[in-house]
Interface confidence: low
Amino acid sequence: THLGIRLPLRSGLAGPPLGLRLPRETDEESEEPGRRGSFVEMVDNLRGKSGQGYYVEMTVGSPPQTLNILVDTGSSNFAVGAAPHPFLHRYYQRQLSSTYRDLRKGVYVPYTQGKWEGELGTDLVSIPHGPNVTVRANIAAITESDKFFINGSNWEGILGLAYAEIARPDDSLEPFFDSLVKQTHIPNIFSLQLCGAGFPLNQTEALASVGGSMIIGGIDHSLYTGRLWYTPIRREWYYEVIIVRVEINGQDLKMDCKEYNYDKSIVDSGTTNLRLPKKVFEAAVKSIKAASSTEKFPDGFWLGEQLVCWQAGTTPWNIFPVISLYLMGEVTNQSFRITILPQQYLRPVEDVATSQDDCYKFAVSQSSTGTVMGAVIMEGFYVVFDRARKRIGFAVSACHVHDEFRTAAVEGPFVTADMEDCGYNIPQTDESTLMTGRA
């Protein structure tokens, strides 16, 4: 899920929801595991650059070595730069840590483009702006990499928060979050609020930092508005979910719902874009093009290769439609929808210094490995990874970017039948989990 590789002039939503609207449940939300309310010490503990990922400060070793670590819900290894590299300002120096233990085992992780490889060990790890604990965790010390680290991104490693099934070299390597939960009394839940830059970058210093929060062990109610809606985690490998319907400005794409989840749908903070299977992508682009036809854009824009620019402050948000994904709900035959705005899926281009224009990339792209709900989706929402109850929660983020006419939304419930049929069953072969990289 490495970012460099894989890492409004209408009020409300367009059109009434299709399908029967069920009455709202009376209790706002069922009891959450873990601590509730305020996690003040963890709020705003993420930083990053738009399109280059969100990172948290961590310390490794004794005495502690401070590193910035990319938060990646699409992989399961804790891996850090451990040798000099032109794009790294600092790296983990195992020889300086009195608590480092060598596992005498190598690890090699190829991506569709690029790779990293390293040596496995364990050491003491803590998160300064996280829970006040230190745990012994597996660490992959990256000794060699290609197209993995990003020049100027300011992170030196990756924290894979998904499940052991996709850990490298195999599922016997316990992921960091599993170690954290096992060794402490921290509940098996974390939540992410990713706050996109939200402005054309020339209104501040270009390449401005974005921020956010990773709440470990619970939910912070100050980070979202409205209620949390939960979708089941289909299988504990990636954070796999099931999409049951897709709408562009309220118009159903009317595809067999299996297509939306071919070959899986995952929530991945380490991917920038909303990535869609080929057929779904083509249908979605066709629909978005039609909705925004008052302006013409080059084909390269829809392929994510070219920018579109407008004079500063004149971006015509209103011509672009909202995108709604309906997710399987916790109750039989019930779904809910999450809706993002063009402010989420048109990404201000970070590496452009100009005072004349606001430029954007289309951050919806084609995938050959299923749907990836990357930062483009997550920046609209507070996302709760409730591992204890095998579910993922979505609520409107208190920091999402919107305008005076439209806002991101999480709404439900909707009646949707036969949702189980929407999941794709991957043929069980030795190859099925080989490609962790998302191109």
């Epitope: 210093e205 270009a206 390269g300 920018l307 100009t354």
Partner: antibody, heavy 119, light 107 residues
Amino acid sequence: QVQLVQSGAEVKKPGASVKVSCKASGYTFTGYYMHWVRQAPGQGLEWMGSINPNSGGTNYAQKFQGRVTMTRDTSISTAYMELSRLRSDDTAVYYCARVRVRHYGMDVWGQGTTVTVSS
Amino acid sequence: DIQMTQSPSSLSASVGDRVTITCRASQSISSYLNWYQQKPGKAPKLLIYAASSLQSGVPSRFSGSGSGTDFTLTISSLQPEDFATYYCQQPLSHPRTFGGGTKVEIK
């Protein structure tokens, strides 16, 4: 008026390094990318790379990777291009040019700096 | 890398002639193409950006057309000051590549 003024001609020996400066005036230096282009005697234009004066982020042509370093000093609105391990075929006129993001056209160019590499 | 091929590499023409220079990209670059004019001993000058947009201050006898892979620079009525070398350039992807140039000489 908007202009880019480059440093004077240089004569260098093979293996040495050269650092060319490009001073911007008449516009907001951090508002435009700066690109570097060179032209060997009697030859065409060759793109070397670019720098974002705002962030210092760079993008180099593969051919020059490892030999070229582009930097900037925003306090004096100046961009620099340093080329190391010079060879005789690096003899060329080196230009800086600013680029507008909307169309990526190099709309203002420096006057050029002649670098001669000879033993 | 995207290769840019210009033709002809040189041409002879008279004042008042209509001159056409073509540029072909090795892959589609939509309308992301710029044209430059360079006179001996001088820095290049931007004439046309985005395939067909005339840069401010450039005479209207210069025009550009094309999209995708094939592009044309046209000088509707050649003037004495137009004798120079012309380059196309793609600004779509790194590395930014230039065509080999077309030298327009006096017949």
